[in-house]
């Protein structure tokens, strides 16, 4: 209209979805009486009356705003509750008197989108793709207005780059009027991107200013060809027979190629394929010296059928051979001498030791053990230990039994055994000598003999305690080609006074043993008895 002043820019009111917008009518008293105002919403140039103020009283017009409008601030402000994205429009108030004037308010609506949801390509990306491949998708749901997406790689924003990086985004409007943004990052990746961290960021605005939300960081499976294959052996370091050894093929490609492990046949020099487990690992358990040799790995790319060979690797399984002692079964007279010699082979330098079997005492460091002026006590076991000092646990041993000719020698001469009448008594008697003696008993009972070692025998006798047996006692006699010897077992009745308070009188008296190492007494008594020391 000629002469009419140009409309001023509307006042901006910013509000978040779901909250209340306060639309303050900015007409001055000179422009209009605020007790008589009409409020309109303007949508696509179309004006719709939504609220009337008469004499300071407000009245909603029927329609979409009917339930959400109320008057505040003595009639100067219209409150719009439960704001939705559809409310983003111009509202105007029009004063009626003294002359028609209007005041325009632009309502801007905002809503932060949900956390961006990133999904990585589950099938991965080959580095040799002809064009950018889909790396990851990013979804930002229920934002208003449409948020902006930025993709990052290792903390740096990604820019569109022809044939290398392409970002494709689209948005959909939900029934609520909110936007869901979907974005897909397409890129040509290189091998170094296998560890790259990607994430997406949503940038959006609220009345309080600019904000952003980041997705979690993801890595992308990147496929690249193998350039090198190699062998790895576990455990690392010196290997020995008996170890569990794993030989595995490794490659610098993803996915790894199909592996096979071969060992060079020492006689034909041909590579022979070894049988690996389901994981392609060659397990040597237990490792033997025959496993030593030259191994290599072949990696076959099933896509290109290109085969790669590793550097060969020498495997050494260290060993100690069976230990040989000479003489193997020495027999000597008392007073004579004996030289024991120990031999073994190994992949490493060996150390020898001689030990007394019964005591574990080290007698000699070296392969030769010399024994002079042999006594019958010198009879028994001698052990040669061949070990590799540089490899803990790598050793072999051999036991040799030295026999000293002599008549039977009793473990004890006489012994007292506490008994109870009618109990079944379990007696034992031990003797040694060379040749090995046999043992007989002077009473009837169930006897059994056990050879303890080449010179030693143990006989056990089960016998019922009778008055006659108490009278006579029990004798065991050991004999061999060179003589005989006897041990006597005196039987004495147990009085209740000989029992200790905590002993069990019913079961505790059921057995009694006489052996060279323990007192020959009933298990129910703690009373110590003199033990004769004479043994021969």
């Amino acid at each position: 209209v000629p002469g009419e002043a140009e409309q001023p820019a509307p006042e901006l009111v910013e509000v978040e979805v779901g909250s209340t917008a306060l639309l303050k009518c900015g007409l001055s008293q000179s422009q209009g009486n605020l007790s008589h105002v009409d409020w309109f919403s303007v949508h696509k140039e179309k004006r719709t009356l939504i609220f009337r103020v008469r004499q300071g009283q407000g009245q909603s017009e029927p329609g979409e705003y009917e339930q959400r409008l109320s008057l505040q601030d003595r009639g100067a402000t219209l409150a719009l509750t439960q704001v939705t994205p559809q409310d983003e429009r111009i509202f105007l108030c029009q004063g009626k008197r003294p002359r028609s004037q209007e005041y325009r308010i632009q309502l801007r609506v905002y809503k932060a989108p949900e956390e961006p949801n990133i999904q990585v390509n589950p099938l991965g990306i080959p580095v040799n793709s002809k064009e950018p491949e889909e790396v990851a998708t990013c979804v930002g749901r229920n934002g208003y207005p449409i948020p902006q997406v930025i993709w990052y790689k290792n903390g740096r924003p990604l820019k569109e780059e022809k044939n290398r990086v392409h970002i494709q985004s689209s948005q959909t409007v939900e029934s609520s009027g909110l936007y869901t943004l979907q974005s897909i990052l397409k890129a040509q990746l290189v091998k170094e991107d296998k560890d790259a961290q990607f994430y997406c960021e949503l940038n959006y605005r609220l009345p309080s200013g600019n904000h952003m939300k980041e997705s979690r960081e993801v890595t992308v499976p990147v496929f690249y060809p193998t350039e090198k294959v190699w062998l790895e052996v576990e455990p690392v370091g010196m290997l020995k027979e008996g170890d569990r050894v794993e030989i595995r093929c490794l490659a610098d490609g993803n996915p790894p190629p199909h592996f096979s492990i071969s060992k060079q046949n020492p006689s034909t020099r041909e590579a022979e394929e070894e049988t690996t487990n389901d994981n392609g690992v060659l397990v040597l358990e237990p490792a033997r010296k025959e496993h030593s040799g030259r191994y290599e790995c072949q990696g076959l790319d099933l896509d290109t059928m290109i085969s790669l060979l590793s550097e060969p690797q020498e495997l050494l399984v260290n060993y100690v051979s069976d230990v040989r002692v000479s003489p193997a079964a020495p027999e000597r007279q008392e007073g004579s001498s004996l030289t024991l010699t120990c031999e073994a082979e190994s992949s490493q330098d060996l150390e020898f030791q001689w030990l007394r079997e019964e005591t574990g005492q080290v007698l000699e460091r070296g392969p030769v053990l010399q024994l002079h002026d042999l006594k019958r006590e010198a009879g028994g076991g001698y052990r040669c230990v061949a070990s590799v000092p540089s490899i803990p646990g790598l050793n072999r041993t051999q036991l040799v039994n030295v026999a000293i000719f002599g008549p039977p020698w009793m473990a004890f001469k006489e012994r007292k055994v506490w008994v109870k009448e009618n109990m079944v008594l379990n007696l034992s008697c031990e003797a040694s000598g060379h040749p090995r003696p046999t043992i007989s008993w002077n009473v009837n009972g169930t006897a059994s003999e056990q050879d303890q070692d080449p010179q030693r025998v143990l006989s056990t006798l089960n016998v019922l305690v009778t008055p006659e047996l108490l009278e006579t006692g029990v004798e065991c006699t050991a004999s061999n080609d060179l003589g005989k010897n006897t041990s006597i077992l005196f039987l004495e009745l147990v009085n209740l006074t000989t029992l200790t308070p905590d002993s069990n009188t019913t079961t505790g008296l059921s057995t009694s043993t006489a052996s060279p190492h323990t007192r020959a007494n009933s298990t129910s008594t703690e009373r110590k008895l003199p033990e004769p020391e004479s043994r021969g």
């Epitope: 949801n117 491949e133 974005s183």
Partner: antibody
């Protein structure tokens, strides 16, 4: 509207090669990837192979050595070849479209039954 | 490979019931999970993607929840057309499906 339709021989002899075709309409193979998924009678679903919108091929490692997936964009067809068939390959074979902004399958074909028998 | 375990394998329910189907992943898959419905003689139909997003055109009685390794599909009020087999699928690393839950009329 988006549609996928599988076609194949129905019956295949053991040790022979299976050729399946997935014909699509309502979208372009250069904007959406397509996968093949199979379902043995009365059993669950098993992903076999995929071809991306960019033409990159992917295979289930359990079948990799006997699979080949390809496409003819002008005919809107995705082809699957599987050799050395055994009776356990008897299944309903589906092709499915990968959603453009996600990694799930938003449209599936009705499937084609393949029986491996002599 | 990531294994997907669905429970129960068979579920009997009546029209109007609220039912819950479970899916467990053998490792953390964040929310890379979809639910499908399959009726006899048909291809599967996607219901839920990204663990909790409803596919366009799917009735709002279907909802998905969960993250990490444990996921749930809930049908708030069963309708006659909902009796079918339901599969979950992970797309975090490769593609693997659960063995399915058959929902039958009690």
């Amino acid at each position: 509207q988006v549609q996928l339709k599988e076609s194949g021989p129905g019956l295949v002899q053991p040790s022979q090669t299976l050729s399946l075709t997935c014909t699509v309409s309502g979208f372009s193979l250069t904007s959406n990837g397509v996968s093949w998924v199979r379902q043995p009678p009365g059993k669950g679903l098993e992903w076999i192979a995929a071809i991306s919108s960019g033409g990159t091929t992917y295979y289930n490692s359990a079948f990799k050595s006997r699979l080949s997936i390809s496409r003819n964009t002008s005919k809107s067809q995705v082809l699957l070849k599987m050799n050395s068939l055994q009776t356990e390959d008897t299944a309903m074979y589906f092709c499915a479209r990968r959603y453009g902004y996600g990694w799930y399958f938003d449209f599936w074909g009705p499937g084609t039954m393949v029986t491996v028998s002599s | 490979d990531i294994r997907m375990t669905q429970s129960p394998s068979l579920l009997s329910a009546s029209v109007g019931d609220r039912v819950t189907l479970n899916c467990k992943a053998s490792q953390n898959i964040y929310n890379s999970l979809a639910w499908y419905q399959q009726k006899l003689g048909e291809g599967p139909k996607v219901l839920i993607f990204n663990a909790n997003s409803l596919q366009t055109g799917i009735p709002s009685r279907f909802s998905g929840s969960g993250s990490g390794t444990d996921f749930t599909l809930t049908i708030s009020s069963l309708q006659p057309e909902d009796f079918a087999t339901y599969f979950c699928q992970q797309f975090y690393s490769g593609y693997t499906f659960g063995a399915g839950t058959k929902l039958e009329l009690k």
